[in-house]
């Protein structure tokens, strides 16, 4: 029995739970998901029983080995998987636990602008990046392009201070999770600040 193995998969994709055994006479291998039996294998008997019929098409054993491949992943496949290898040659079953996290492929992140002010020719605002569907474990970073050196900023909120007359800047939000990344539409500082240009003391949402 080894330490818990953490696995990551994407919705619609596949994941393989690695399993090896040097036991000669394996009587049975039992896979469970959150305490519910998933598959029972009897290598000598040549039988593989998938407990729920709907999972039959999703279960495979690459290269005829003991590792279990689960495909067409869904969000609710996330959870704890457990395998026990039972053999008359073992005093107790050999076991392994896995934790699977299934993530969605990220859609394009949405950017909203906070309160904007324009004082002394400087446009000041916040840009907030977020996912419309509230996906989990998303990390946001901002890329600011166009100054002498390109800059990065961590976090979903980017504070902006852009002075009229400076070269235009482009802001892009990058959203990442363990299986994908996506980019917002680029936002130009000049366009963003145009609304406040006429009235040096204006503020808008």
């Amino acid at each position: 029995s080894g330490p818990v193995k953490e696995l990551v998969g994407s919705v619609g994709g596949a994941v393989t739970f690695p399993l090896k055994s040097k036991v000669k006479q394996v009587d049975s291998i039992v896979w469970t998901f959150n305490t519910t039996p998933l598959v029972t294998i009897q290598p000598e008997g040549g039988t593989i029983i998938v407990t729920q019929n709907r999972n039959r098409e999703r279960v495979d054993f690459p290269d005829g080995g003991y590792s279990l491949k689960l495909s067409k992943l869904k969000k609710n496949d996330s959870g704890i998987y457990y395998v026990g290898i039972y053999s008359s040659s073992l005093q107790q079953p050999s076991t392994q636990e896995y934790v699977l996290h299934v993530y969605e492929h990220l859609s394009k992140p949405k950017v909203t602008m906070g309160l904007q002010s324009n004082k002394n020719g400087t446009c000041v605002t916040n840009l907030t990046c977020c996912m419309e569907h509230g996906e989990e474990d998303v990390i946001y970073t901002w890329k600011a392009l166009g100054q002498a050196a390109n800059e990065s900023h961590n976090g979903s909120i980017l504070p902006i201070s852009w002075r009229w007359g400076e070269s235009d800047m482009t802001f892009i939000c990058v959203a990442r999770n363990p299986v994908s990344r996506n980019f917002s539409s680029p936002i130009l500082a000049r366009k963003l600040c145009e609304g406040a240009a006429d009235d040096p003391d204006s503020s808008m949402v």
Partner: antibody, heavy 120, light 108 residues
């Protein structure tokens, strides 16, 4: 990648013996059953027996007990099948084939076959 | 020993055809049946094990089904490279394992 390479064709006289070898590579030889299967001209495939190289344990088809002897050498990852008291009906192509782990009776990798001809 | 009776012994078909081969075991073998493809002068190649599990790399036009005593191999749309002889084999519990005598799939 997994490979099973068998020894070359043999021509033997009735009553003689022959030893066919099967050299394995690309996997842990000692941890998988090795099967032997024969295919006589115009006949069905016949399972002869299998050996577990890790400890030399063997299982035979009753029809081939006393006819075939299976052995394995872990140091060279080679399996052997010896056929004794050869008769003309033993003329066949003999294959070694590795068992899958998940279903030990299913065979996923096969040697290229060794033709044994028994003729006076 | 368990007998495996395969039918038909040969069949003629065209590229694109759906082909079905059946195998009957003389006693219950649960789902412990494998299917192999063999081309002249070559070793058999594993297609399906445990009745319905496609071996790695086998195209999904090959499908195995059945349990108990009746088993089927279906090729959904025959391709030029599929013309060969197909064998069923029971791999249930204690050996000996036994094979069907083959179905030769020929070009019509």
């Amino acid at each position: 990648q997994v490979q099973l390479v068998q020894s070359g064709a043999e021509v033997k006289k009735p009553g003689a013996s022959v030893k066919v070898s099967c050299k394995a590579s690309g996997y842990t030889f000692s941890s998988s059953w090795m099967n032997w299967v024969r295919q006589a001209p115009g006949q069905c495939l016949e399972w002869i027996g299998r050996i577990y190289p890790g400890d030399g344990d063997t299982k035979y088809n009753g029809k081939f007990k006393g006819k075939a002897t299976l052995t394995a050498d872990k140091s060279t990852s080679t399996a052997y099948m010896e056929l004794s008291s050869l008769r003309s009906e033993d003329t066949a192509v003999y294959y070694c084939a590795r068992s899958t782990m998940i279903a030990t009776g299913a065979m996923d990798y096969w040697g290229q076959g060794t033709l044994v001809t028994v003729s006076s | 020993d368990i007998q495996m009776t395969q039918s038909p012994s040969s069949l003629s078909a065209s590229v694109g055809d759906r082909v079905t081969i059946t195998c009957k075991a003389s006693q219950d073998v649960s789902t412990a049946v494998a299917w192999y493809q063999q081309k002249p002068g070559k070793a058999p190649k594993l297609l399906i094990y445990s009745a319905s599990y496609r071996y790695t790399g086998v195209p999904d036009r090959f499908t195995g089904s059945g349990s108990g005593t009746d088993f089927t191999l279906t090729i959904s749309s025959l391709q030029p490279e599929d013309f060969a002889t197909y064998y069923c084999q029971q791999h249930y519990s204690t050996p000996p394992y036994t094979f069907g005598c083959g179905t030769k799939v020929e070009i019509k």
